[in-house]
Interface confidence: low
């Protein structure tokens, strides 16, 4: 057959779907690889062809669109499973072609099983809620396009294994789950089960997400440098090791980049001709406030190094701060020598 632009296996799209549930999968060509959409391609006389390779097989085979009750079907650029089966797992390819043009991409589809408490190998999206920050909502994800707006589905929300009914601060509101006020005890997995009718059959969509309660923006502060501080003096003799920790607390801020860095005499350590190493460690609180520690280390400090200015800097979306470390050269202990005074006495 003639040449085809092969985009290979699109592993960025690790599609996971639950067994025995509907799944609609859009051909990635139009979303990520081509500059035109399906409608344009279709009206230009291009045809979209689907085929697949079963798990642990090398043989590409056509998808059977003649299964009972149209279990697998194609609609425009969407491949439909109504519903999926475990052995639908494999690599799926969509190919767009006519006599002069061809482009194709493959993507992995994994059909996963869940238990009665919705536990499964599915990778869960994480939804962050601000602690004690008024009313916040999570929305049942990825259910668009499964049923027309004329169909009114029933939605049931669960936390872990339990249906949400009389949760003090969480209210189911259709596709939304409202948290009247979020507490750390609200951390966990929330599942919405959307049930809708189609052609005399009833389908279920199960969507689970992880809620993580994080620090509130109303409590957020600029970075706080705990060390260095005014109470600690780094007094060293030449030849000793100089270790200065820079410990910074960052309030949780959504999408904020937290940074810590040292300057020596106003320059980055890399730009100074001394043997400096910097080691960083990061820890998080339960609400994802962050503590970063950067330890500046000079193995054998010189008297010149002890005269330099060492400043710890920190920056977040809330602001920038800096603090200088107090570094001194140890003053040698005085030597008490007996000095004989000349002419001590009358002349």
């Amino acid at each position: 057959s003639e040449r085809c632009d092969d985009w290979g296996l699109d592993t960025m799209r690790q599609i996971q779907v639950f067994e025995d549930e509907p799944a609609r999968i859009k051909c990635p060509l139009f979303e990520h690889f081509l500059k035109f959409n399906y409608s344009t391609a279709h009206s230009a006389g291009l045809t979209l062809i689907w085929y697949w390779t079963r798990q642990d097989r090398d043989l590409e085979e056509p998808i059977n669109f003649r299964l009972p009750e149209n279990r697998i079907s194609k609609e425009k650029d969407v491949l439909w499973f109504r519903p999926t089966l475990l052995n639908d797992t494999g690599n799926y390819t969509c190919m767009l072609r006519n006599t002069t043009y061809c482009s194709k991409v493959a993507f992995p589809l994994e059909v996963v099983q869940k238990d009665s408490c919705f536990n499964s190998p599915m990778k869960l999206p994480v939804h962050k809620l601000y602690i004690e920050y008024g009313i916040q909502r999570i929305t049942c994800p990825n259910v668009d396009g499964y049923f027309p707006s004329s169909v009114k589905p029933t939605i049931t929300w669960y936390m872990g294994c339990y249906k949400i009914q009389n949760f003090n601060n969480v209210i189911p509101e259709g596709m939304n789950l409202s948290f009247l006020i979020a507490f750390i005890s609200n951390n966990g997995n929330y599942t919405c089960v959307v049930t809708y009718p189609e052609n005399g059959r009833t389908f279920h969509l199960t969507r689970t997400l992880t809620v993580k309660v994080v620090g509130s923006p109303k409590n957020a502060v600029p970075p706080v440098i705990h060390s260095p501080n005014d109470h600690v003096v780094y007094e060293k003799e030449p030849g000793e090791e100089l270790l200065i920790p820079c410990t910074v607390y960052f309030s949780f801020l959504m999408d904020s980049r937290n940074e810590v860095w040292w300057t020596i005499d106003g320059k980055k350590p890399d730009d100074i001709p001394i043997d400096v190493t910097i080691n960083e460690s990061i820890s998080h609180s339960r609400t994802e406030d962050e503590t970063r520690t950067q330890i500046l280390s000079i193995k054998k400090v010189t008297s010149e190094d002890l005269k330099r200015s060492y400043v710890c800097h920190a920056r977040s979306a809330k602001g920038e701060v800096a603090k200088a470390a107090t570094v001194k050269q140890k003053v040698p202990a005085p030597r008490y020598t007996v000095e004989l005074a000349c002419g001590f006495g009358a002349t």
Epitope: G134, R137, K152, N176
Partner: antibody, heavy 119, light 112 residues
Framework: EVQLVESGGGLVKPGGSLRLACAAT????????MSWVRQGSGKGLEWVGR??????????DYAAPVKGRFTISRDDSKNTLYLQMNSLKTEDTAMYYC??????????WGQGTLVTVSS | DIVMTQSPLSLPVTPGEPASISCRSG???????????LAWYLQKPGQSPQLLIY???NRASGVPDRFSGSGSGTDFTLKISRVEAEDVGVYYC?????????FGQGTRLEIK
Amino acid sequence: EVQLVESGGGLVKPGGSLRLACAATGFTFSNVWMSWVRQGSGKGLEWVGRIKSKADGGTIDYAAPVKGRFTISRDDSKNTLYLQMNSLKTEDTAMYYCTTGELLGFDYWGQGTLVTVSS
Amino acid sequence: DIVMTQSPLSLPVTPGEPASISCRSGQSLLHSNGFNCLAWYLQKPGQSPQLLIYLGSNRASGVPDRFSGSGSGTDFTLKISRVEAEDVGVYYCMQTLQTPITFGQGTRLEIK
């Protein structure tokens, strides 16, 4: 920070039309139920209507005095709520506020836009 | 429609003294999930209303703790433990159990 900014108010003759807009920032607009509330000069608060989020079906409910004359809509791509007011009456003269939420109360309010219906 | 009735309609108070406003609804505002669909607002002169209390008794973010809400079903009360000059304005109760959403007539709090 949540902000709701209404616009489009003004003076209009009875029987005329006006379209109010409410630009929302600081929250995921598409997820939130939005309402219009009005207040006549020296009078109390009166609920005008509400539009649910599209995820909840986008259902729209209206207060009896405006049903059939007013239309609430939303453009989630523009984070904007609208109130199309037709066949305006003198009793529609009021400050119009857009608000967020519903079940647990209206948690945020705009500064309001004044509509005056007078010949 | 659920009719909301507030009393008193006017409330003169000495600063530092407590104040209490009553709100009665024409039918129970108790939601099937076990909370009351009642909110309280304060509208200060020349300003938009601000949410004080939701679900009958939950103080909204940033609201001083001198404000408290109580009650269930059809009878609700907003209490201010010690009135301050900045508390002047019109207080409204509102039900959100069902549409149309309805407000009380308002209670004007003024300093004696």
